[in-house]
């Protein structure tokens, strides 16, 4: 079943290559187990950036080597992606799945265009 997911249209990464955005979903029921996946669409390909499954009221747990961190509050997920470089500029899509209890729901946001600008190297000082 389909579910509405909202996310900002554009986000600019900071000078350290970190970008944050909120992914909000309209839960049709009382889900206890939620899976959040961040996808990147660029060059006619969609790749998975990171994913986490969490129990409502608990923290999101990404894999140790993930570039993503996040927190949840109700039907909102605050996502942070780190270590971004200019080449990582692209459309980042939030996918939310209500895993338990049934019925299964899935929603996909319209994507957040994340712009990453590599910082200029500091000039050598004499």
């Amino acid at each position: 079943k389909a579910m509405h997911v909202a996310q900002p249209a554009v986000v600019l990464a900071n000078s350290r290559g970190t970008a944050s955005f909120v992914c909000e979903y309209a839960s049709p029921g009382k889900a206890t187990e939620v899976r959040v996946t961040v996808l990147r669409q660029a060059d006619s390909q969609v790749t998975e950036v990171c994913a986490a499954t969490y129990m409502m009221g608990n923290e999101l747990t990404f894999l140790d080597d993930s570039i993503c961190t996040g927190t949840s509050s109700g039907n909102q997920v605050n996502l942070t992606i780190q270590g971004l470089r200019a080449m990582d500029t692209g459309l980042y899509i939030c996918k939310v799945e209500l895993m338990y209890p049934p019925p299964y729901y899935m929603g996909i946001g319209n994507g957040t265009q994340i712009y990453v600008i590599d910082p200029e190297p500091c000039p050598d000082s004499d």
Epitope: Q41, V46, L91, I93, N110
Partner: nanobody, 126 residues
């Protein structure tokens, strides 16, 4: 760059079945809208079936409803067209087509397609 490759065509008797496969080389079909078209000698190309990027929506031409089934096998990076109860009028070259839409349209079939395979011949004859 992604290329589409069809397989599974051949000669089959009326009432028989064939399973056409559309695979991607040089990339994945994840979240792509995929369509199957066919063209019989002396006839216009017609869309037979399509499946949305999420796989939640499928469409069929009236002439194949109830006989053909389209599905995604993301683990094998393929889209399958299962053709049952084949008739002589199903004889044609079958083409796989694909397009990666904006995420807001992942639940829909594409209106037009960017990518076309080379086609596979299906002949239904006794």
């Amino acid at each position: 760059e992604v290329q589409l490759v069809e397989s599974g065509g051949g000669l089959v008797q009326p009432g028989g079945s064939l399973r056409l496969s559309c695979a991607a080389s040089g990339g994945t079909l994840d979240y792509w809208s995929i369509g199957w078209f066919r063209q019989a000698p002396g006839k216009e190309r017609e869309e037979v079936s399509c499946i949305s990027g999420t796989g939640l929506r499928t469409n069929y031409a009236d002439s194949v409803k109830g006989r053909f089934t389209i599905s995604r096998d993301n683990s094998k990076n393929t889209v399958i067209l299962q053709m049952n109860s084949l008739r002589a009028e199903d004889t044609a070259v079958y083409y796989c087509t694909g397009k990666l839409l904006h995420p807001s349209l992942w639940s829909a079939c594409a209106n037009e397609y960017d990518l076309w395979g080379q086609g596979t011949q299906v002949t239904v004859s006794s």
